[in-house]
C-alpha cells in the first residue's frame, strides 16, 4: 500500500518513530529515538533469541538433563535453542522433549510395525494369520509360520499368533 499504513515488517512503533527490531541473536538495549538508532546487543553464551525482536533479555538455552534420560542432539546458537533427544532405548514424552521414557516392547502375539526413535515410541501390530511372535521385544517383527511343505514335512500342530507351527514327518503308511 502507498503510503505505508504501519511500520515496515522488521520495525516496531515507539514514541511516534518506526524503529528497527533487533535481529535474531540480539536483544534490545535501547529504542531508537529521533536522534539515535535502535541499539541491540548479541546474546551471551548459552542464550538465544530466534526471531526479530524487541526483547530486553535473551532466553536461556534448554538444558538436556541426563537424569531424565536426555542428551544434546543439536547445540544451541545465539539464534537457536538447544535440541534435546533421548538416550538409546528411550524416547521423548512430548514434542518439547522435556523427559524420556523407555521404549515399549511388543508382547507375544504382537510384532514391531515401526521401531522407536528418540522422539517416537515403538508401534506394535497384532500378528496376522500366518505370522507369530513368541517374545516380548522392541525390535522383532512378526515372523511367518514355518512352511512344512517346503521341508517335505506336514503340520503336526497348527500355529497361532504366539507360536509357530510344529512340523513332523509325513505318515509313510499313507504314501
Amino acid at each position: 500500500p502507498e503510503p505505508p499504513t504501519a511500520c515496515r515488517e522488521k520495525q516496531y512503533l515507539i514514541n511516534s518513530q518506526c524503529c528497527s527490531l533487533c535481529q535474531p541473536g540480539q536483544k534490545l538495549v535501547s529504542d531508537c529515538t529521533e536522534f539515535t538508532e535502535t541499539e541491540c546487543l548479541p546474546c551471551g553464551e548459552s542464550e538465544f533469541l530466534d526471531t526479530w525482536n524487541r526483547e530486553t533479555h535473551c532466553h536461556q538455552h534448554k538444558y538436556c538433563d541426563p537424569n531424565l534420560g536426555l542428551r544434546v542432539q543439536q547445540k544451541g546458537t545465539s539464534e537457536t535453542d538447544t535440541i534435546c533427544t533421548c538416550e538409546e532405548g528411550w524416547h521423548c514424552t512430548s514434542e518439547a522433549c522435556e523427559s524420556c521414557v523407555l521404549h515399549r516392547s511388543c508382547s507375544p502375539g504382537f510384532g514391531v510395525k515401526q521401531i522407536a526413535t528418540g522422539v517416537s515410541d515403538t508401534i506394535c501390530e497384532p500378528c496376522p494369520v500366518g505370522f507369530f511372535s513368541n517374545v516380548s521385544s522392541a525390535f522383532e517383527k512378526c515372523h511367518p509360520w514355518t512352511s512344512c511343505e517346503t521341508k517335505d514335512l506336514v503340520v503336526q500342530q497348527a500355529g497361532t499368533n504366539k507360536t509357530d507351527v510344529v512340523c513332523g514327518p509325513q505318515d509313510r503308511l499313507r504314501a
Epitope: 502507498e2 503510503p3 505505508p4 499504513t5 504501519a6 511500520c7 515496515r8 515488517e9 522488521k10 520495525q11 512503533l13 511516534s16 518513530q17 518506526c18 524503529c19 528497527s20 527490531l21 533487533c22 535481529q23 538508532e37 535502535t38 541491540c40
Partner: antibody, heavy 125, light 107 residues
C-alpha cells in the same frame, strides 16, 4: 552513526549496463527500506524505486520498469541498483537513500533521512 | 503521476531575510510532504517531514506548513549556510515525485 557509502564514478557506452552499490553501516540494514533516486546534471531529483532489504522484494517506478534491477546482500549490508540498455540521458548522479517512517495523527509518514554521497554515471560513446 | 510545482524557481535574498518557498501539488496529498536542502556536489538533506515536522539536528529557523495541495517552507532568518537548492517531495502516491527545486542565491 548511520552511513551509506556508494561505489565510485562509472563511464559507460550506450547499450551497456551499470551496477551501483550502496553499503550501509551504523544501523540494522534489514530493518529499513532502501530507495534509489537519480539527478541528471543541473536537473531535479527523480525517484526510481525501492527494495525491502529483508525480503529482497523491489518496487520500481514505471519509467524504469524492465531496465532497472534492485538487489541486496544482507551479509554485507549492501544494496545494489543495476540499470541496463543505457542511453545518454541516463547520465546522472545516482543516490541511495534510507526510508524513515514517522507516526502522527493516525498516519505513517515516510521520508528519506540518510543519503549516500552519490555515484556519477556518465553514458557516452 | 502527482506533479509538484515549486515557486519561485530562483530566489535572491540577503542574510537575515525571511524566505518563503511554496510547493503546490496537482492533487491533494494530505501531509505526505517532505522538504530537502541540497548544496552543490552534495546529497540532499532532510529538513522537514510530514509537512511540518522538523528533522532532528535541523535549525529551528526552518519550518514547514500546509496540507492538501499547498505547502510552504519558511526560513525565518536566512544564514550564509542556507544558500542552496530546496526540493519538496510528495510521498502519498507512487512514483514519489519531487518538485523542480528552488535555488536560493545571495543578493
Amino acid at each position: 552513526q548511520v552511513q551509506l557509502v556508494q561505489s565510485g564514478a562509472e563511464v559507460k557506452k550506450p547499450g551497456a549496463s551499470v551496477k551501483v552499490s550502496c553499503k550501509a553501516s551504523g544501523y540494522t540494514f534489514a530493518g529499513y527500506y532502501m530507495y534509489w533516486v537519480r539527478q541528471a546534471p543541473g536537473q531535479g531529483l527523480e525517484w526510481m524505486g525501492w527494495i525491502n532489504p529483508d525480503s529482497g522484494a523491489p518496487t520500481y517506478a514505471q519509467k524504469f520498469q524492465g531496465r532497472v534491477t534492485m538487489t541486496r546482500d544482507t551479509s554485507i549490508s549492501t544494496a545494489y541498483m543495476e540499470l541496463s540498455r543505457l542511453r545518454s540521458d541516463d547520465t546522472a548522479v545516482y543516490y541511495c537513500a534510507r526510508e524513515k517512517i514517522y507516526y502522527g495523527s493516525g498516519n505513517y509518514y515516510p521520508s528519506f533521512d540518510y543519503w549516500g554521497q552519490g555515484t556519477l554515471v556518465t553514458v557516452s560513446s | 503521476d502527482i506533479q509538484l510545482t515549486q515557486s519561485p524557481s530562483f530566489l535572491s535574498a540577503s542574510v537575515g531575510d525571511r524566505v518563503t518557498i511554496t510547493c503546490r501539488a496537482s492533487q491533494g496529498i494530505s501531509s505526505y510532504l517532505a522538504w530537502y536542502q541540497q548544496k552543490p556536489g552534495k546529497a540532499p538533506k532532510l529538513l522537514i517531514y510530514a509537512a511540518s515536522t522538523l528533522q532532528s539536528g535541523v535549525p529551528s529557523r526552518f519550518s514547514g506548513s500546509g496540507s492538501g495541495t499547498e505547502f510552504t517552507l519558511t526560513i525565518s532568518s536566512l544564514q550564509p549556510e542556507d544558500f542552496a537548492t530546496y526540493y519538496c517531495q510528495q510521498l502519498l502516491s507512487y512514483p514519489w515525485t519531487f518538485g523542480q527545486g528552488t535555488k536560493v542565491e545571495i543578493k
